[in-house]
Protein backbone atom coordinates (compact mmCIF):
# COMPACT_ATOMS: atom_id res chain seq x y z
CA UNK A 1 0.00 0.00 0.00
CA UNK A 2 1.37 3.21 -1.41
CA UNK A 3 1.18 6.56 -3.25
CA UNK A 4 1.78 6.49 -6.91
CA UNK A 5 5.06 8.29 -7.41
CA UNK A 6 5.21 11.00 -9.41
CA UNK A 7 2.33 11.95 -10.52
CA UNK A 8 1.51 16.16 -9.18
CA UNK A 9 -1.22 15.42 -6.78
CA UNK A 10 -4.55 18.25 -7.57
CA UNK A 11 -7.53 18.34 -6.16
CA UNK A 12 -8.15 21.87 -7.48
CA UNK A 13 -11.04 22.24 -9.83
CA UNK A 14 -13.45 25.08 -11.42
CA UNK A 15 -14.41 27.49 -7.98
CA UNK A 16 -12.18 25.85 -5.48
CA UNK A 17 -8.67 26.03 -4.74
CA UNK A 18 -7.52 22.44 -3.27
CA UNK A 19 -4.40 21.54 -1.89
CA UNK A 20 -3.37 17.10 -1.41
CA UNK A 21 -1.12 16.77 1.50
CA UNK A 22 0.28 13.76 3.10
CA UNK A 23 -1.85 12.89 6.26
CA UNK A 24 -0.89 10.97 9.29
CA UNK A 25 -4.42 10.14 9.51
CA UNK A 26 -5.07 12.02 12.62
CA UNK A 27 -6.44 15.09 11.63
CA UNK A 28 -5.97 17.58 14.85
CA UNK A 29 -9.67 18.77 14.31
CA UNK A 30 -10.17 15.59 16.70
CA UNK A 31 -7.59 17.60 19.77
CA UNK A 32 -9.46 20.93 18.79
CA UNK A 33 -13.19 19.73 18.17
CA UNK A 34 -15.19 22.68 16.35
CA UNK A 35 -19.03 23.41 16.92
CA UNK A 36 -19.60 23.47 13.28
CA UNK A 37 -18.87 20.37 11.03
CA UNK A 38 -19.93 19.07 7.84
CA UNK A 39 -21.97 16.01 7.01
CA UNK A 40 -20.76 13.20 5.71
CA UNK A 41 -20.20 12.66 1.94
CA UNK A 42 -23.08 11.32 0.00
CA UNK A 43 -21.72 8.39 -2.51
CA UNK A 44 -18.26 6.69 -2.58
CA UNK A 45 -17.84 4.77 -5.54
CA UNK A 46 -14.32 2.80 -5.55
CA UNK A 47 -12.87 1.23 -9.11
CA UNK A 48 -9.74 -0.48 -10.17
CA UNK A 49 -7.57 1.19 -12.25
CA UNK A 50 -4.20 1.03 -13.73
CA UNK A 51 -1.64 3.47 -13.94
CA UNK A 52 1.91 3.98 -14.59
CA UNK A 53 5.04 4.88 -12.24
CA UNK A 54 7.69 7.29 -13.15
CA UNK A 55 10.15 3.81 -14.13
CA UNK A 56 7.23 2.55 -16.57
CA UNK A 57 5.63 -0.50 -14.33
CA UNK A 58 1.78 -0.69 -14.85
CA UNK A 59 0.55 -0.66 -10.96
CA UNK A 60 -3.06 -1.23 -9.78
CA UNK A 61 -4.81 1.95 -8.13
CA UNK A 62 -8.13 2.33 -6.31
CA UNK A 63 -10.01 5.35 -8.34
CA UNK A 64 -12.02 6.91 -4.83
CA UNK A 65 -14.78 9.38 -5.91
CA UNK A 66 -16.99 10.82 -3.77
CA UNK A 67 -20.03 13.64 -4.01
CA UNK A 68 -20.92 16.19 -1.46
CA UNK A 69 -24.44 16.72 -0.04
CA UNK A 70 -26.78 19.17 -1.12
CA UNK A 71 -26.68 20.96 2.27
CA UNK A 72 -25.62 24.12 4.17
CA UNK A 73 -22.91 22.00 5.62
CA UNK A 74 -20.53 22.66 2.58
CA UNK A 75 -19.73 26.20 3.87
CA UNK A 76 -18.32 24.84 6.96
CA UNK A 77 -16.36 21.73 4.86
CA UNK A 78 -12.66 22.81 5.23
CA UNK A 79 -11.21 19.33 3.17
CA UNK A 80 -11.56 15.80 3.58
CA UNK A 81 -9.16 13.26 4.89
CA UNK A 82 -8.92 9.74 2.99
CA UNK A 83 -7.99 7.01 4.09
CA UNK A 84 -6.96 3.15 2.87
CA UNK A 85 -6.71 0.38 5.46
CA UNK A 86 -5.22 -3.03 4.01
CA UNK A 87 -7.28 -5.68 6.23
CA UNK A 88 -4.81 -8.57 6.64
CA UNK A 89 -1.80 -6.16 7.44
CA UNK A 90 -3.43 -3.52 8.75
CA UNK A 91 -1.41 -0.70 7.06
CA UNK A 92 -2.72 2.36 6.38
CA UNK A 93 -2.30 5.57 4.14
CA UNK A 94 -3.95 8.26 4.41
CA UNK A 95 -3.75 11.84 2.24
CA UNK A 96 -6.00 15.10 3.08
CA UNK A 97 -7.79 17.74 0.66
CA UNK A 98 -6.96 21.05 2.14
CA UNK A 99 -9.62 23.79 0.49
CA UNK A 100 -8.09 26.69 0.03
CA UNK A 101 -11.26 28.38 -0.67
CA UNK A 102 -14.70 28.27 0.65
CA UNK A 103 -17.09 25.39 -0.97
CA UNK A 104 -19.99 27.62 -2.81
CA UNK A 105 -23.04 25.91 -3.57
CA UNK A 106 -23.38 25.97 -7.52
CA UNK A 107 -25.69 24.20 -10.25
CA UNK A 108 -23.82 20.63 -10.33
CA UNK A 109 -23.37 18.80 -7.07
CA UNK A 110 -19.77 18.89 -6.04
CA UNK A 111 -17.57 16.00 -7.15
CA UNK A 112 -14.10 14.52 -5.74
CA UNK A 113 -12.20 11.84 -7.29
CA UNK A 114 -8.54 10.61 -6.11
CA UNK A 115 -6.79 7.90 -7.89
CA UNK A 116 -2.98 7.72 -6.40
CA UNK A 117 -3.33 4.72 -3.97
CA UNK A 118 -1.02 1.78 -5.59
CA UNK A 119 -2.54 -1.98 -4.29
CA UNK A 120 -1.73 -5.40 -4.24
CA UNK A 121 -3.50 -8.13 -6.17
CA UNK A 122 -6.21 -10.25 -4.69
CA UNK A 123 -6.12 -8.08 -1.19
CA UNK A 124 -8.99 -6.39 0.41
CA UNK A 125 -9.25 -2.33 1.28
CA UNK A 126 -11.41 -0.34 3.57
CA UNK A 127 -11.59 2.94 2.32
CA UNK A 128 -13.14 5.62 4.37
CA UNK A 129 -13.76 9.50 3.45
CA UNK A 130 -13.59 11.51 6.44
CA UNK A 131 -15.12 15.11 5.74
CA UNK A 132 -12.94 18.11 7.95
CA UNK A 133 -13.69 19.14 10.50
CA UNK A 134 -14.28 15.82 12.18
CA UNK A 135 -17.00 16.23 14.64
CA UNK A 136 -17.27 16.69 18.48
CA UNK A 137 -17.11 13.14 20.24
CA UNK A 138 -20.58 13.25 20.56
CA UNK A 139 -21.32 14.72 17.37
CA UNK A 140 -23.35 12.88 14.28
CA UNK A 141 -19.87 11.05 12.26
CA UNK A 142 -19.26 13.06 8.91
CA UNK A 143 -17.19 10.00 7.37
CA UNK A 144 -18.30 7.17 5.09
CA UNK A 145 -16.74 3.84 4.48
CA UNK A 146 -16.02 0.83 1.65
CA UNK A 147 -14.80 -2.10 1.56
CA UNK A 148 -12.86 -3.03 -1.74
CA UNK A 149 -11.73 -6.20 -3.14
CA UNK A 150 -8.80 -5.87 -5.67
CA UNK A 151 -8.98 -8.83 -8.16
CA UNK A 152 -6.46 -11.19 -8.04
CA UNK A 153 -4.01 -11.46 -11.12
CA UNK A 154 -6.36 -13.96 -13.41
CA UNK A 155 -8.26 -11.10 -13.96
CA UNK A 156 -8.03 -9.73 -17.28
CA UNK A 157 -6.94 -6.04 -15.91
CA UNK A 158 -4.47 -7.66 -13.65
CA UNK A 159 -2.73 -9.65 -15.88
CA UNK A 160 -0.87 -6.86 -17.16
CA UNK A 161 0.40 -4.74 -14.57
CA UNK A 162 3.91 -5.57 -12.88
CA UNK A 163 3.34 -7.35 -9.87
CA UNK A 164 1.38 -10.10 -11.64
CA UNK A 165 3.17 -9.77 -14.26
CA UNK A 166 6.81 -10.64 -11.93
CA UNK A 167 4.43 -14.00 -10.59
CA UNK A 168 4.16 -15.32 -14.11
CA UNK A 169 0.18 -13.71 -14.90
CA UNK A 170 0.90 -13.77 -18.73
CA UNK A 171 2.02 -18.11 -19.01
CA UNK A 172 -0.53 -19.93 -19.91
CA UNK A 173 0.23 -23.58 -19.54
CA UNK A 174 -2.77 -24.91 -20.59
CA UNK A 175 -2.89 -28.22 -18.63
CA UNK A 176 -4.17 -31.40 -20.10
CA UNK A 177 -4.40 -34.61 -17.71
CA UNK A 178 -4.64 -37.63 -19.15
CA UNK A 179 -5.46 -41.27 -17.47
CA UNK A 180 -3.05 -43.57 -18.39
CA UNK A 181 -3.17 -47.77 -18.50
CA UNK A 182 -1.93 -49.31 -15.21
CA UNK A 183 -2.59 -46.32 -12.93
CA UNK A 184 -1.35 -43.79 -14.57
CA UNK A 185 -2.00 -40.39 -15.27
CA UNK A 186 -0.34 -37.87 -17.55
CA UNK A 187 0.07 -34.12 -17.17
CA UNK A 188 1.25 -31.80 -20.38
CA UNK A 189 1.67 -28.62 -20.10
CA UNK A 190 3.31 -25.78 -22.23
CA UNK A 191 6.63 -24.19 -21.06
CA UNK A 192 7.35 -20.30 -20.66
CA UNK A 193 10.19 -18.27 -22.31
CA UNK A 194 12.27 -18.87 -19.57
CA UNK A 195 14.96 -21.32 -18.77
CA UNK A 196 13.93 -21.86 -15.25
CA UNK A 197 12.69 -24.95 -13.31
CA UNK A 198 9.18 -26.73 -12.67
CA UNK A 199 7.23 -29.08 -10.20
CA UNK A 200 4.25 -30.96 -10.60
CA UNK A 201 2.32 -31.86 -7.66
CA UNK A 202 -0.36 -34.42 -7.87
CA UNK A 203 -2.47 -34.86 -4.18
CA UNK A 204 -5.54 -37.60 -4.84
CA UNK A 205 -8.15 -37.23 -2.53
CA UNK A 206 -11.08 -39.92 -1.65
CA UNK A 207 -14.43 -38.75 -3.28
CA UNK A 208 -16.23 -38.54 0.13
CA UNK A 209 -13.54 -37.29 2.10
CA UNK A 210 -11.05 -33.94 1.99
CA UNK A 211 -8.30 -36.01 3.47
CA UNK A 212 -5.51 -36.63 1.87
CA UNK A 213 -4.75 -40.08 0.28
CA UNK A 214 -1.62 -39.67 -2.10
CA UNK A 215 0.75 -36.98 -2.98
CA UNK A 216 3.77 -36.97 -5.07
CA UNK A 217 5.69 -34.31 -6.62
CA UNK A 218 7.86 -34.53 -9.60
CA UNK A 219 10.77 -32.03 -10.79
CA UNK A 220 11.08 -30.74 -13.98
CA UNK A 221 14.79 -29.43 -15.18
CA UNK A 222 14.75 -26.01 -16.61
CA UNK A 223 14.16 -26.51 -20.43
CA UNK A 224 16.55 -25.28 -22.90
CA UNK A 225 15.87 -22.55 -25.13
CA UNK A 226 14.52 -24.82 -27.99
CA UNK A 227 12.41 -26.24 -25.84
CA UNK A 228 10.66 -22.39 -24.86
CA UNK A 229 6.86 -23.14 -25.34
CA UNK A 230 6.63 -26.53 -26.29
CA UNK A 231 4.86 -29.48 -23.98
CA UNK A 232 6.39 -31.12 -21.53
CA UNK A 233 4.99 -34.14 -20.44
CA UNK A 234 4.77 -35.91 -16.32
CA UNK A 235 3.58 -39.07 -16.11
CA UNK A 236 2.50 -39.96 -12.21
CA UNK A 237 1.61 -43.62 -10.89
CA UNK A 238 -1.35 -43.25 -8.96
CA UNK A 239 -2.74 -45.09 -5.34
CA UNK A 240 -3.73 -48.68 -6.10
CA UNK A 241 -6.53 -47.79 -3.77
CA UNK A 242 -9.65 -47.40 -6.15
CA UNK A 243 -11.45 -44.98 -3.74
CA UNK A 244 -8.56 -42.37 -3.96
CA UNK A 245 -9.40 -41.51 -7.49
CA UNK A 246 -10.00 -37.38 -6.59
CA UNK A 247 -6.73 -36.11 -8.25
CA UNK A 248 -5.52 -32.54 -7.88
CA UNK A 249 -2.70 -31.41 -10.00
CA UNK A 250 -0.69 -28.07 -9.77
CA UNK A 251 2.04 -26.48 -11.89
CA UNK A 252 4.55 -24.35 -10.13
CA UNK A 253 7.20 -21.86 -12.22
CA UNK A 254 10.46 -21.13 -10.46
CA UNK A 255 10.79 -17.92 -12.66
CA UNK A 256 13.54 -15.57 -11.88
CA UNK A 257 11.01 -12.88 -10.83
CA UNK A 258 8.38 -14.52 -8.28
CA UNK A 259 11.42 -17.59 -7.41
CA UNK A 260 9.06 -20.00 -5.34
CA UNK A 261 6.28 -17.76 -5.41
CA UNK A 262 4.98 -17.45 -8.10
CA UNK A 263 1.67 -18.32 -9.52
CA UNK A 264 0.17 -21.65 -9.65
CA UNK A 265 -2.11 -23.54 -12.16
CA UNK A 266 -3.63 -25.97 -11.20
CA UNK A 267 -6.65 -28.80 -12.12
CA UNK A 268 -8.66 -31.41 -10.90
CA UNK A 269 -9.88 -34.59 -12.30
CA UNK A 270 -13.08 -35.56 -10.33
CA UNK A 271 -13.79 -39.21 -9.58
CA UNK A 272 -15.38 -40.96 -12.41
CA UNK A 273 -18.78 -41.89 -12.49
CA UNK A 274 -18.87 -45.42 -12.29
CA UNK A 275 -21.92 -47.04 -14.33
CA UNK A 276 -22.85 -50.55 -14.43
CA UNK A 277 -22.01 -51.32 -17.74
CA UNK A 278 -18.03 -50.24 -17.09
CA UNK A 279 -17.21 -51.74 -14.11
CA UNK A 280 -15.71 -54.86 -13.68
CA UNK A 281 -16.35 -57.42 -10.69
CA UNK A 282 -14.31 -56.01 -7.99
CA UNK A 283 -11.00 -58.10 -7.58
CA UNK A 284 -9.98 -57.88 -3.50
CA UNK A 285 -9.92 -53.89 -2.58
CA UNK A 286 -9.80 -52.60 -5.82
CA UNK A 287 -12.14 -51.71 -8.99
CA UNK A 288 -10.11 -50.31 -12.21
CA UNK A 289 -10.88 -47.06 -12.58
CA UNK A 290 -11.38 -47.36 -16.40
CA UNK A 291 -11.65 -49.71 -19.38
CA UNK A 292 -8.40 -49.49 -21.38
CA UNK A 293 -9.32 -48.71 -24.67
CA UNK A 294 -5.59 -48.55 -26.77
CA UNK A 295 -3.89 -46.69 -24.08
CA UNK A 296 -6.36 -43.73 -23.33
CA UNK A 297 -9.09 -43.59 -20.96
CA UNK A 298 -12.94 -43.86 -20.93
CA UNK A 299 -12.90 -40.75 -19.43
CA UNK A 300 -10.36 -38.79 -21.24
CA UNK A 301 -13.43 -36.32 -22.57
CA UNK A 302 -14.25 -35.53 -19.34
CA UNK A 303 -10.21 -35.39 -18.01
CA UNK A 304 -9.95 -32.60 -21.08
CA UNK A 305 -13.25 -30.87 -19.77
CA UNK A 306 -11.75 -30.83 -16.71
CA UNK A 307 -8.12 -29.26 -17.40
CA UNK A 308 -9.95 -26.30 -19.22
CA UNK A 309 -11.42 -25.18 -15.65
CA UNK A 310 -7.34 -24.50 -14.08
CA UNK A 311 -7.28 -21.61 -12.06
CA UNK A 312 -4.28 -19.85 -10.45
CA UNK A 313 -3.38 -20.52 -6.82
CA UNK A 314 -1.19 -17.64 -5.40
CA UNK B 1 -0.28 0.75 28.32
CA UNK B 2 -2.14 -1.49 25.03
CA UNK B 3 -4.17 -3.90 26.94
CA UNK B 4 -7.12 -5.63 26.03
CA UNK B 5 -9.90 -7.24 28.22
CA UNK B 6 -12.67 -9.72 27.36
CA UNK B 7 -15.86 -9.96 29.21
CA UNK B 8 -19.10 -11.49 28.99
CA UNK B 9 -18.28 -15.28 28.77
CA UNK B 10 -20.24 -17.85 31.04
CA UNK B 11 -22.14 -20.93 31.01
CA UNK B 12 -25.04 -21.43 28.57
CA UNK B 13 -27.14 -24.30 27.33
CA UNK B 14 -26.63 -25.63 23.47
CA UNK B 15 -29.23 -23.10 21.48
CA UNK B 16 -28.52 -20.48 23.93
CA UNK B 17 -26.99 -17.02 23.34
CA UNK B 18 -24.24 -15.07 24.93
CA UNK B 19 -22.22 -11.46 24.03
CA UNK B 20 -18.53 -11.16 24.87
CA UNK B 21 -17.24 -7.71 25.10
CA UNK B 22 -13.31 -6.63 24.30
CA UNK B 23 -12.55 -3.47 26.05
CA UNK B 24 -9.56 -1.59 24.20
CA UNK B 25 -7.05 0.56 26.06
CA UNK B 26 -3.62 2.32 24.98
CA UNK B 27 -4.54 3.03 21.42
CA UNK B 28 -6.28 4.16 19.02
CA UNK B 29 -8.72 1.67 18.63
CA UNK B 30 -10.42 3.12 15.86
CA UNK B 31 -7.26 2.79 13.36
CA UNK B 32 -7.21 -0.98 13.84
CA UNK B 33 -9.06 -3.79 12.27
CA UNK B 34 -10.01 -6.13 15.55
CA UNK B 35 -10.17 -9.94 15.70
CA UNK B 36 -11.99 -13.03 17.76
CA UNK B 37 -9.81 -16.13 18.12
CA UNK B 38 -11.12 -18.75 19.88
CA UNK B 39 -9.21 -22.29 21.85
CA UNK B 40 -11.41 -25.40 22.57
CA UNK B 41 -9.86 -27.19 25.76
CA UNK B 42 -6.68 -28.96 24.78
CA UNK B 43 -7.04 -28.06 21.50
CA UNK B 44 -5.51 -25.27 18.94
CA UNK B 45 -6.20 -21.51 18.14
CA UNK B 46 -9.48 -20.98 15.78
CA UNK B 47 -9.77 -18.43 14.01
CA UNK B 48 -13.35 -16.72 14.48
CA UNK B 49 -13.87 -13.56 12.96
CA UNK B 50 -12.30 -10.07 11.72
CA UNK B 51 -13.97 -6.65 11.66
CA UNK B 52 -12.03 -3.57 9.68
CA UNK B 53 -11.96 -0.05 11.55
CA UNK B 54 -14.60 1.17 10.53
CA UNK B 55 -17.02 -1.69 10.24
CA UNK B 56 -17.60 -1.87 6.02
CA UNK B 57 -15.55 -5.29 6.30
CA UNK B 58 -16.26 -8.51 8.22
CA UNK B 59 -15.59 -11.73 7.76
CA UNK B 60 -16.17 -15.25 9.75
CA UNK B 61 -14.67 -18.80 9.84
CA UNK B 62 -17.34 -21.02 8.14
CA UNK B 63 -17.65 -23.20 11.78
CA UNK B 64 -19.94 -19.67 13.05
CA UNK B 65 -21.02 -18.12 10.44
CA UNK B 66 -24.63 -17.59 10.44
CA UNK B 67 -24.62 -17.74 14.37
CA UNK B 68 -22.27 -15.18 15.24
CA UNK B 69 -21.99 -11.18 14.47
CA UNK B 70 -19.00 -9.33 15.34
CA UNK B 71 -19.72 -5.49 16.28
CA UNK B 72 -17.77 -3.08 17.73
CA UNK B 73 -18.30 1.15 19.02
CA UNK B 74 -15.51 2.91 18.28
CA UNK B 75 -16.38 5.88 20.55
CA UNK B 76 -16.59 3.12 23.39
CA UNK B 77 -13.22 1.88 22.54
CA UNK B 78 -15.20 -2.15 22.48
CA UNK B 79 -15.38 -4.94 20.20
CA UNK B 80 -18.46 -7.23 20.32
CA UNK B 81 -19.41 -10.75 19.55
CA UNK B 82 -22.88 -11.68 19.93
CA UNK B 83 -22.76 -15.50 19.68
CA UNK B 84 -26.53 -17.55 18.88
CA UNK B 85 -27.70 -21.35 18.11
CA UNK B 86 -24.72 -22.16 20.61
CA UNK B 87 -23.31 -25.50 20.33
CA UNK B 88 -21.18 -27.83 22.60
CA UNK B 89 -18.59 -27.59 19.93
CA UNK B 90 -18.24 -23.53 20.66
CA UNK B 91 -17.20 -24.36 24.27
CA UNK B 92 -13.68 -22.49 24.19
CA UNK B 93 -11.45 -19.42 25.63
CA UNK B 94 -12.45 -16.48 23.61
CA UNK B 95 -9.13 -14.00 22.75
CA UNK B 96 -9.72 -10.86 21.13
CA UNK B 97 -6.74 -9.52 19.51
CA UNK B 98 -5.13 -7.02 17.71
CA UNK B 99 -3.58 -6.90 14.09
CA UNK B 100 -0.08 -6.14 13.81
CA UNK B 101 1.06 -3.18 11.22
CA UNK B 102 2.99 -5.38 9.07
CA UNK B 103 0.87 -8.90 9.99
CA UNK B 104 0.04 -10.76 12.47
CA UNK B 105 -1.52 -10.45 15.88
CA UNK B 106 0.74 -8.66 18.58
CA UNK B 107 -2.08 -7.50 21.24
CA UNK B 108 -4.35 -10.33 22.73
CA UNK B 109 -6.52 -10.01 25.55
CA UNK B 110 -6.43 -13.01 28.96
CA UNK B 111 -9.37 -14.60 27.00
CA UNK B 112 -12.92 -14.86 28.63
CA UNK B 113 -14.13 -18.55 28.90
CA UNK B 114 -17.24 -20.08 27.30
CA UNK B 115 -18.52 -23.22 28.56
CA UNK B 116 -22.12 -24.57 26.09
CA UNK B 117 -23.52 -27.67 28.10
CA UNK B 118 -27.06 -29.16 28.88
CA UNK C 1 -10.17 -22.60 1.72
CA UNK C 2 -6.34 -22.87 2.51
CA UNK C 3 -4.95 -25.21 5.27
CA UNK C 4 -2.50 -24.85 6.79
CA UNK C 5 -0.16 -28.25 8.26
CA UNK C 6 2.45 -28.11 10.69
CA UNK C 7 4.78 -31.13 11.36
CA UNK C 8 5.61 -32.12 13.78
CA UNK C 9 2.91 -32.29 15.84
CA UNK C 10 4.83 -32.87 18.93
CA UNK C 11 8.77 -32.92 19.74
CA UNK C 12 10.97 -33.48 22.28
CA UNK C 13 14.80 -32.00 22.27
CA UNK C 14 17.81 -31.26 24.35
CA UNK C 15 19.10 -27.89 25.51
CA UNK C 16 20.97 -25.98 22.94
CA UNK C 17 19.67 -28.30 20.30
CA UNK C 18 18.77 -26.53 16.84
CA UNK C 19 15.07 -26.96 16.83
CA UNK C 20 13.15 -26.52 13.23
CA UNK C 21 9.04 -26.80 13.03
CA UNK C 22 7.65 -26.67 9.53
CA UNK C 23 4.37 -24.93 8.04
CA UNK C 24 2.38 -25.72 4.95
CA UNK C 25 0.12 -24.03 3.11
CA UNK C 26 -2.26 -25.64 0.62
CA UNK C 27 -1.87 -22.64 -1.85
CA UNK C 28 1.01 -20.19 -2.37
CA UNK C 29 0.70 -17.54 0.47
CA UNK C 30 3.63 -15.41 -0.41
CA UNK C 31 4.79 -14.32 2.84
CA UNK C 32 1.86 -13.84 4.23
CA UNK C 33 2.00 -15.87 7.43
CA UNK C 34 3.21 -15.51 11.26
CA UNK C 35 4.35 -17.92 14.08
CA UNK C 36 3.59 -17.41 17.51
CA UNK C 37 4.02 -19.16 20.85
CA UNK C 38 1.56 -20.31 23.32
CA UNK C 39 2.75 -21.26 27.10
CA UNK C 40 0.33 -23.34 28.84
CA UNK C 41 -2.51 -21.46 30.75
CA UNK C 42 -1.00 -18.23 29.09
CA UNK C 43 -2.41 -16.44 25.73
CA UNK C 44 -0.34 -16.58 22.32
CA UNK C 45 2.32 -14.17 21.68
CA UNK C 46 3.44 -13.40 18.27
CA UNK C 47 7.30 -14.82 17.44
CA UNK C 48 7.59 -13.60 13.80
CA UNK C 49 5.52 -12.09 11.10
CA UNK C 50 5.91 -11.59 7.26
CA UNK C 51 7.52 -15.38 7.30
CA UNK C 52 10.92 -13.76 8.57
CA UNK C 53 10.33 -10.52 10.64
CA UNK C 54 11.24 -10.92 14.23
CA UNK C 55 8.46 -9.03 16.80
CA UNK C 56 9.92 -6.66 18.58
CA UNK C 57 11.29 -8.05 22.48
CA UNK C 58 11.61 -11.76 20.64
CA UNK C 59 15.22 -13.55 21.56
CA UNK C 60 16.65 -13.37 18.12
CA UNK C 61 17.18 -17.67 18.50
CA UNK C 62 13.63 -17.49 16.51
CA UNK C 63 13.93 -16.98 13.26
CA UNK C 64 11.69 -17.70 10.24
CA UNK C 65 12.17 -18.32 6.43
CA UNK C 66 9.71 -18.99 3.45
CA UNK C 67 7.54 -18.26 0.81
CA UNK C 68 5.05 -19.04 -0.59
CA UNK C 69 3.77 -22.54 0.40
CA UNK C 70 6.64 -23.84 2.84
CA UNK C 71 7.75 -22.31 5.91
CA UNK C 72 10.09 -22.59 8.51
CA UNK C 73 10.55 -21.75 12.05
CA UNK C 74 13.80 -22.40 13.97
CA UNK C 75 15.18 -22.11 17.18
CA UNK C 76 19.12 -22.12 17.21
CA UNK C 77 19.57 -23.37 20.51
CA UNK C 78 16.66 -24.51 22.06
CA UNK C 79 16.42 -22.56 26.01
CA UNK C 80 13.81 -24.39 29.34
CA UNK C 81 11.63 -21.33 28.62
CA UNK C 82 10.78 -22.06 25.24
CA UNK C 83 8.60 -24.95 26.03
CA UNK C 84 5.35 -24.07 24.31
CA UNK C 85 3.09 -24.75 21.30
CA UNK C 86 3.74 -23.05 18.41
CA UNK C 87 1.15 -22.10 15.94
CA UNK C 88 1.49 -20.50 12.49
CA UNK C 89 -1.33 -18.76 10.67
CA UNK C 90 -1.94 -17.28 7.67
CA UNK C 91 -3.12 -14.33 6.75
CA UNK C 92 -2.97 -13.71 2.70
CA UNK C 93 -6.94 -13.53 3.02
CA UNK C 94 -9.77 -14.21 4.75
CA UNK C 95 -10.15 -16.92 6.79
CA UNK C 96 -6.73 -16.26 8.46
CA UNK C 97 -6.30 -19.86 9.46
CA UNK C 98 -3.79 -21.20 11.84
CA UNK C 99 -1.89 -24.56 11.78
CA UNK C 100 -2.71 -27.17 14.42
CA UNK C 101 0.62 -26.29 16.17
CA UNK C 102 3.44 -28.00 17.67
CA UNK C 103 4.57 -28.78 20.91
CA UNK C 104 8.54 -28.79 22.09
CA UNK C 105 9.21 -29.87 25.30
CA UNK C 106 12.56 -30.53 26.64
CA UNK C 107 14.13 -34.30 26.89
Known amino acids: LRLLDHRALVCSQPGLNCTVKNSTCLDDSWIHPRNLTPSSPKNIYINLSVSSTQHGELVPVLHVEWTLQTDASILYLEGAELSVLQLNTNERLCVRFEFLSKLRHHHRRWRFTFSHFVVDPDQEYEVTVHHLPKPIPDGDPNHQSKNFLVPDCEHARMKVTTPCMSSGSLWDPNITVETLEAHQLRVSFTLWNESTPYQVLLESFSDSENHSCFDVVKQIFAPRQEEFHQRANVTFTLSKFHWCCHHHVQVQPFFSSCLNDCLRHAVTVPCPVISNTTVPKPVADYIPLWEPRSGSSDYKDDDDKGSSHHHHHH | EVQLVESGGGSVQPGGSLRLSCAASGFTFSSYSMNWVRQAPGKGLEWVSI????????HYADSVKGRFTISRDNAKNSLYLQMNSLRDEDTAVYYC???????????WGQGTTVTVSS | DIQMTQSPSSLSASVGDRVTITCRAS??????LAWYQQKPGKFPELLIYAASTLQSGVPSRFSGSGSGTDFTLTISSLQPEDVATYYC?????????FGPGTKVDIK
Open chain 3, 89 to 97: QKYNRAPFT
Open chain 3, 27 to 32: QGISNY
Open chain 2, 51 to 58: ISSRSSII
Open chain 2, 97 to 107: ARPKVGGGMDV
